[in-house]
């Protein structure tokens, strides 16, 4: 999906008002210095591409985050503010949801969510030069 036509400011508002709090809740009990940020993004569409991938695509050691509250809210925000997102993405993530077993918070998942926090912070500061 091409995130170029999203309403970035409205997605930012949804992140600041609710998604960010759910990410913090998920990471509660974890030190902010525990994980190094290894995933980066260069602009807002790129950030959303990376956020979409890390949130909804299963990775080794972290089968799925899609059922977490922050993920459901991310999906809702993208569905509302990114025209065409629902048609291209929702069915795929729903198929994954059916295959998924019980929720398990592994260290790998915590690391992945830490990366997500970094991506979201970068999304919110699009004018900053890439480090």
């Amino acid at each position: 999906y091409d995130f170029t036509n999203c309403d970035f400011e409205k997605i930012k508002a949804a992140y600041l008002s609710t998604i960010s709090k759910d990410l913090i809740t998920y990471m509660s009990g974890t030190k902010s210095t525990e994980f190094n940020n290894t995933v980066s993004c260069s602009n807002r569409p790129h950030c959303l591409t990376e956020i979409q991938s890390l949130t909804f695509n299963p990775t080794a050691g972290c089968a799925s985050l899609a059922k977490e509250m922050f993920a459901m809210k991310t999906k809702a925000a993208l569905a509302i503010w990114c025209p065409g997102y629902s048609e291209t993405q929702i069915n795929a993530t729903q198929a994954m949801k059916k295959r998924r077993k019980r929720k398990v918070t592994t260290n790998k998942c915590l690391e992945q969510v830490s990366q997500l926090q970094g991506l979201w912070r970068r999304f919110n500061r699009p004018l900053l030069k890439q480090q």
Epitope: D7, S17, A76, W81
Partner: antibody
Framework: QVQLVQSGAEVKKPGSSVKVSCKAS????????INWVRQAPGQGLEWLGV????????IYAEKFQGRVTITADTSTSTAYMELSSLRSEDTAVYYC?????????????WGQGTLVTVSS | QSALTQPPSASGSPGQSVTISCTGT?????????VSWYQQHPGKAPKLMIY???KRSSGVPDRFSGSKSGNTASLTVSGLQAEDEADYYC???????????FGGGTKLTVL
């Protein structure tokens, strides 16, 4: 069962406000959109706005911007639509309608409608 | 004045086919595959018939079909039956600000 139940008919004076409720049951309230649509006597359907409780997002039709407020109470699975500065042209049946999960612009479940009459 | 334009009326005899059009712009119908159609009988709430241009809602007979060409969407009812007599409304998604637009409605009469 899966349904939306709306509050009863209202008679209001011009210039006043009305608040209509819509109680959801049988589905996960927060994940869906709750839209509000009205129909004046003998007229067509008109969309007022939508709320997606999961993310607290509301979007209003330009025509009603500043005059309509849509809210939701997730603890009671109830959505509300308040319309202010009422005039006679606001006399209509007001429907709440569920927007499909993540496809909030398709209304797959409707309330029974609430008749709001604005008359002096 | 509705944002989407529908003919006020359409008619057909039992067994015949009838097509109802819904015309918009490139900012709504032409820009997205997010057209839906609703059936409304007198005194009743509307019912979703077609969504995503051509997908039938559950329980809707396959006599109802939807299509789109450019800025115009169409609802076709084939093998008309008496119970198909109702008002039909089209809607289209119209971007993140406008969100949803309704057509003015078409009264379908089964002769």
């Amino acid at each position: 069962q899966v349904q939306l139940v709306q509050s009863g008919a209202e008679v209001k004076k011009p210039g006043s406000s009305v608040k209509v409720s819509c109680k959801a049951s049988g589905f996960t309230f927060g994940s869906y959109g709750i839209n509000w649509v009205r129909q004046a006597p003998g007229q067509g359907l008109e969309w007022l706005g939508v709320i997606v409780p999961l993310v607290g997002v509301t979007i209003y039709a330009e025509k009603f911007q500043g005059r309509v407020t849509i809210t939701a109470d997730t603890s009671t699975s109830t959505a509300y639509m308040e319309l202010s500065s009422l005039r006679s042209e606001d006399t209509a049946v007001y429907y709440c309608a569920r927007g499909q999960e993540y496809f909030y612009w398709y209304f797959d479940l409707w309330g029974q409608g609430t008749l709001v009459t604005v008359s002096s | 004045q509705s944002a989407l334009t529908q003919p006020p009326s359409a008619s057909g005899s039992p067994g015949q086919s009838v097509t109802i059009s819904c015309t918009g712009t490139s900012s709504d119908i032409g820009g997205y595959n997010r057209v839906s159609w609703y059936q409304q009988h007198p005194g009743k709430a509307p019912k979703l018939m077609i969504y995503e241009v051509n997908k039938r809602s559950s329980g809707v007979p396959d006599r109802f079909s939807g299509s789109k060409s450019g800025n115009t969407a169409s609802l076709t009812v084939s093998g008309l039956q008496a119970e198909d007599e109702a008002d039909y409304y089209c809607t289209s998604y119209a971007g993140t600000d406008t969100f949803v637009l309704f057509g003015g409605g078409t009264k379908l009469t089964v002769l």
